[in-house]
């Protein structure tokens, strides 16, 4: 039990950063825990995420990765990573096709535990100045390029 007035020690030594990606590209979020063997959960809008053709979940030692494949405007919004009692929120912002390059034909994906399908190889930019929100999206405004804020 932490002393009154003192924040509990975060389970994360590296927190995911909010990013901005072109529609059709993958978005990759990384977190590092203080030690290996820590069970990590990822969420979107408070809803748990499980591995699928859409979501790649990988763990190597202390490094935990969430890959959101072929992002579309509907993927824009608030995400979180949870380890123990530590929860860190971060955001995904999607730049629509008319503001970015169109989706590329699927290319061979790097090997991943969940067997990723082809992904358009486009880098995710750390979130800086906010661009206009995609039409029809009711996601909240995004933070700047700082690691996600803890929400313990």
């Amino acid at each position: 039990m932490p002393e009154p007035g003192k924040k509990p020690v975060s389970a994360f030594s590296k927190k995911p950063r909010s990013v901005e990606v072109a529609a059709g590209s993958p978005a990759v979020f990384e977190a590092e825990t203080e030690r290996a063997g820590v069970k990590v959960r990822w969420q979107r809008g408070g809803s748990d995420i499980s591995a699928s053709n859409k979501y790649g979940l990988a763990t190597e030692g202390t490094r935990h990765t969430l890959t959101v494949r072929e992002v579309g405007p509907a993927d824009q919004g608030s995400y979180a990573v949870i380890a123990g009692s530590s929860k860190v929120k971060f955001d995904l912002k999607v730049i629509e096709a008319e503001k970015a390059e169109p989706m590329l034909a699927p290319a061979p994906a790097p090997a991943e535990a969940t067997g990723a399908p082809g992904e358009a190889p486009a880098p995710a930019a750390e979130l800086g100045e906010s661009a206009p929100s995609p039409k029809g999206s009711s996601s909240a405004a995004l933070n700047g390029p700082t690691p996600g804020a803890p929400d313990d």
């Epitope: 748990d48 699928s52 053709n53």
Partner: antibody, heavy 118, light 107 residues
Framework: QVQLKESGPGLVAPSQSLSITCTVS????????VNWVRQPPGKGLEWLGM???????DYNSVYKSRLSISKDNSKSQVFLKMNSLQTDDTARYYC????????????WGQGTSVTVSS | DILMTQSPAILSVSPGERVSFSCRAS??????MHWYQQRTNGSPRLLIR???ESFSGIPSRFSGTGSGTDFTLRINSVESEDIADYYC?????????FGAGTKLELK
């Protein structure tokens, strides 16, 4: 096992509002999103909106001005309220769980039939 | 909104035949596409998510392919219990939209 069950009024007068409850079991609403989808008689499926685990919502812009989705996690219930109903709102209304592997809908209720008529 | 166009509207088959359903999106949606089956007087049932990933408990005779704008659902040997309506749905952008459906009927 995962179950969703809708309950509604059956008959609604034109210009009145519609309230439907979706009661779920086998999973917690804090960790899953729930969608609302409707199907007019003899026609296809139409997505109305959804509520996320954290209570945030996304709506079909066509209905956003007269649609509200909310929930009570402790009662495992999700609520749909639609105002100003017209005869073309006659449909079967379904609630469906959002798949944790993405935005598909993995489990559906049996639906509740709503007729808008005077 | 993204328009999902399904063809044909009706497919007539004999048991044991291989059948293909087509769904075309009005814009590139990657693989953000799902297939559902709805039997008469029943609720929709998820068959395939993200174009090609079979949902748990779905018979192996169902498969999905496609990416971008063109998608296909196949049943490699139709059984009588497969007689139903089939819908595609995109989750690339809000609002989520469904195709008008293809009705599978017996010859």
């Amino acid at each position: 096992q995962v179950q969703l069950k809708e309950s509604g009024p059956g008959l609604v007068a034109p210009s009145q509002s519609l309230s439907i409850t979706c009661t779920v079991s086998g999973f917690s609403l804090t960790g899953y999103g729930v969608n609302w989808v409707r199907q007019p008689p003899g026609k296809g499926l139409e997505w109305l909106g959804m509520i996320w685990g954290d209570g945030s919502t996304d709506y079909n812009s066509v209905y956003k001005s007269r649609l509200s989705i909310s929930k009570d996690n402790s009662k495992s219930q999700v609520f749909l309220k639609m105002n100003s109903l017209q005869t073309d709102d006659t449909a079967r209304y379904y609630c469906a769980r959002r798949d944790t592997g993405g935005a598909s809908m993995d489990y559906w209720g049996q639906g509740t039939s709503v007729t808008v008529s005077s | 909104d993204i328009l999902m166009t399904q063809s044909p509207a009706i497919l007539s088959v004999s048991p044991g035949e291989r059948v293909s359903f087509s769904c075309r999106a009005s814009q590139n949606i990657g693989t953000n596409m799902h297939w559902y089956q709805q039997r008469t007087n029943g609720s929709p049932r998820l068959l395939i998510r993200f174009a090609s990933e079979s949902f748990s408990g779905i018979p192996s005779r169902f498969s999905g392919t496609g990416s971008g704008t063109d998608f296909t659902l196949r049943i490699n040997s139709v059984e009588s219990e497969d007689i139903a309506d089939y819908y595609c749905q995109q989750s690339y952008n809000w609002p989520f939209t469904f195709g008008a459906g293809t009705k599978l009927e017996l010859k």
